[in-house]
Amino acid sequence: ATSCPQNVNISGGTFTLSHGWAPGSLLIYSCPQGLYPSPASRLCKSSGQWQTPRATRSLTKAVCKPVRCPAPVSFENGIYTPRLGSYPVGGNVSFECEDGFILRGSPVRQCRPNGMWDGETAVCDNGAGHCPNPGISLGAVRTGSRFGHGDKVRYRCSSNLVLTGSAERECQGNGVWSGTEPICRQPYSYDFPEDVAPALGTSFSHMLGATNPTQRTKESLGRKIQIQRSGHLNLYLLLDSSQSVSENDFLIFKESASLMVDRIFSFEINVSVAIITFASEPKVLMSVLNVNSRDITEVISSLENAKYKDHENGTGTNTYAALNSVYLMMNNQMQLLGMKTMAWQEIRHAIILLTDGKSNMGGSPKTAVDQIREILNINQKRNDYLDIYAIGVGKLDVDWRELNELGSKKDGERHAFILQDTKALHQVFEHMLDVSKLTDTICGVGNMSANASDQERTPWHVTIKPKSQETCRGALISDQWVLTAAHCFRDGNDHSLWRVNVGDPKSQWGKEFLIEKAVISPGFDVFAKKNQGILEFYGDDIALLKLAQKVKMSTHARPICLPCTMEANLALRRPQGSTCRDHENELLNKQSVPAHFVALNGSKLNINLKMGVEWTSCAEVVSQEKTMFPNLTDVREVVTDQFLCSGTQEDESPCKGESGGAVFLERRFRFFQVGLVSWGLYNPCLGSADKNSRKRAPRSKVPPPRDFHINLFRMQPWLRQHLGDVLNFLPL
């Protein structure tokens, strides 16, 4: 059998083969960060010879060359230093403006290992035009220097750089430039996941009904709320499974798409998902016309059933046919719903194309995009009804021009990306969608990204304090109600002296609220069982506080989901007829359930809630506690089934001041409060004035640490009695 020669090493780099040394196999070179391979790949021909794309000679020696970033071609109304033909990785370029001009963007930019500049385009602007000066990105040349309403500017890139973004932009009536900023990049450059995730996420969040409060100062950013919760989104996932995609990479495409689907369903919008795999021909695995496209389990299942081998007979990359099958799907749906109906016109459409190369058959994919734009009547007014994300993976044969042509162009957003590999793609999809920026009272959303603040991660978390020192914690369960522990109020202080501190994006200290009323469980009496040798009893340790004003929802303040409510049911994506018992079964679904509480310093700490038969072994050590319970005869009188138990294994123990805080868990990227911190056998903060200092109990401690949390599933009648008109409760 024919095979290609094996003398294809690259000095300083490595290579992988898609199908061994056999004809049809793609050899892909890779180099350490800061270097790029030249050539990037070779293809084993049926003749047994390696072919290098776009090479004149049949076999050039492969080398790793240093990555460089493009130099500014011109910089208006200012100067830049140093002036070089191109810049090495780690090199800086600095910008200064002439008198009378203000610098917008980054004054210093550094060349990154992917051949891209960090920061934002520097612009020297005097604010004279109807639109701001759109600037000239590094490596670009602009024609057009008038910025009045209707004026156009055009861009091209110098030498062999590739333009991504809009080659032409127009100053619109609202003072915003049409399209998206053009960037000139090296053909071998690629995007880092940490850049793509927020860029993709910002765009996607806008489409999903999110404004981005952190960026409201830039008026060009933040399309207003697009999809109300009654709106509908059609999401079309197009997965390349052509020959150049290895089976392993195809699996990662699938996994990434699954992550995407999982996240998208965690927004409480109506969504239908189509799944199309393609090589020479497309294969529709799920159509938006199928009622199952609205059901996450069905969508994920059809994704899981996508087979790499489905396309083994046709191994080209026919992106046109894939996009055309989206067009046909749209056309069928339009016929079904009626072209003039709101039902059709109000559907928003998002296409995500995951590909590893450029289309090599079937004609220009741009033709299909034009048809799609036409059928959806995409014009300046309806621009928000279509988003096409073109994501190239693997630096090889991905065609920047084609990706750029396919991706949507929207101001302040990017829709075309190239990632180094499928691992990077996976990272992007993991961190891309952040529901925490939604402005309505959607519950249980915390920002999970690595750079989020503690309060953004747990925006329901509040501090309850009298005028003097902090005493307790609590959780927002609506925009005006806080759930906490009754024992925080056992001294009977006038609650008008108390304050509730709620997270606020404008202040690291949060915002103080007065308490309109405190509802303390009448069953709570810490001395109720004194005559049974139980000096302190925490049954019914639950209270509700109504704040004097409503809390404005933000990244820092948002309610947690309470189980057994419609709100939580939506977040869990459970069917409509679900009951409270269903929620308990889903949330407390193991003998040991990983959960969290929030520490005095705001960090999220881990515990394991012991359930079922393990609950008793967790709870029974209380009988060894002789200080709190000197003459205890029946441990069941202290630890009733109102309590959840933690404190075994490597669990953290809550401190005294953490009482009343939520005990919560994460499901489907949303957070649910199952308990509230009540009492325990060990205080890890005892004797420490430092909020960050906690001491673990010595292993020899008798009794060992145990912590008890009011189980919200056992407090349903009381919660329903007081929150019946605030939350929508499910049947028990």
Partner: antibody
Framework: QVQLRESGPGLMKPSETLSLTCTVS????????YYWTWIRQPPGKGLEWI?????????DYNPSLKSRVTISVDTSKNQFSLRLNSVSAADMAVYYC??????????????WGQATLVTVSS | SSELTQDPTVSVALGQTVRITCQGD??????ASWYQQKPGQAPVLVLY???NRPSGIPDRFSGSSSGNTASLTITGAQAEDEADYYC???????????FGGGTKLTVL
């Protein structure tokens, strides 16, 4: 509404292996909060717990039967099964499958199957 | 010991109150659960925990516990309450369960 239904042979010969299956509808055997249980009742006598299984694979058995009994769960079919080796006349009983639930200090069986009578005779 | 002891038979006049008891060491740690079984039928859970009734069980059934003894009380016994009553509880670790020998309740 949760329903359990036992199935398996009614007549056995001594020393054979008894295999019973319980099919669960209206609920899932992979739910992590329940203990899928077999209980038997010899004619005219009281209830005897045979064993319980948690979907993750942990099983507990009556010490008097431990050497002969195996309980397993098949999540794909939403079923759990009982295997009792080397049956004898002493194993003749009505066999129930049931769903066990542990809450606080109590442990109870909230749903039962309709029962299957197993006769052992040579 | 892992035994639960019940009186084999108890009788009660219609409309009167009757108490059925269950004794065993495990009841010092765990609450008993109670089941009613009528001839030819599967047992039905009537009480669990300290004193909890599943939905559909009349409130004339109540439970209590003291030391190593658990009690099921029927206040105002009805003819349809005539049945065998079994108690059960966990013992030791895991899901080990023990049943009482059963009490046959006759309503006169």
């Amino acid at each position: 509404q949760v329903q359990l239904r036992e199935s398996g042979p009614g007549l056995m010969k001594p020393s054979e292996t008894l295999s019973l299956t319980c099919t669960v509808s209206g609920g899932s055997v992979s739910s992590g909060v329940y203990y899928w249980t077999w209980i038997r009742q010899p004619p005219g006598k009281g209830l005897e717990w045979i064993g319980s299984m948690f979907y993750s694979g942990n099983a507990d058995y009556n010490p008097s039967l431990k050497s002969r009994v195996t309980i397993s769960v098949d999540t794909s079919k939403n079923q759990f099964s009982l295997r009792l080796n080397s049956v004898s006349a002493a194993d003749m009983a009505v066999y129930y499958c049931a769903r066990g639930y542990a809450s606080g200090w109590s442990y109870y069986f909230d749903y039962w199957g309709q029962a299957t009578l197993v006769t052992v005779s040579s | 010991s892992s035994e639960l002891t019940q009186d084999p038979t108890v009788s009660v006049a219609l409309g009167q109150t009757v108490r059925i008891t269950c004794q065993g060491d495990s009841l010092r740690t765990y609450y008993a659960s109670w089941y009613q079984q009528k001839p030819g039928q599967a047992p039905v859970l009537v009480l669990y925990g300290k004193n909890n009734r599943p939905s559909g069980i009349p409130d004339r059934f109540s439970g209590s516990s003291s030391g190593n003894t658990a009690s099921l009380t029927i206040t105002g016994a009805q003819a349809e309450d005539e049945a065998d009553y079994y108690c059960n509880s966990r013992y030791s670790s895991g899901t080990h369960v023990v049943f009482g020998g059963g009490t046959k309740l006759t309503v006169l």
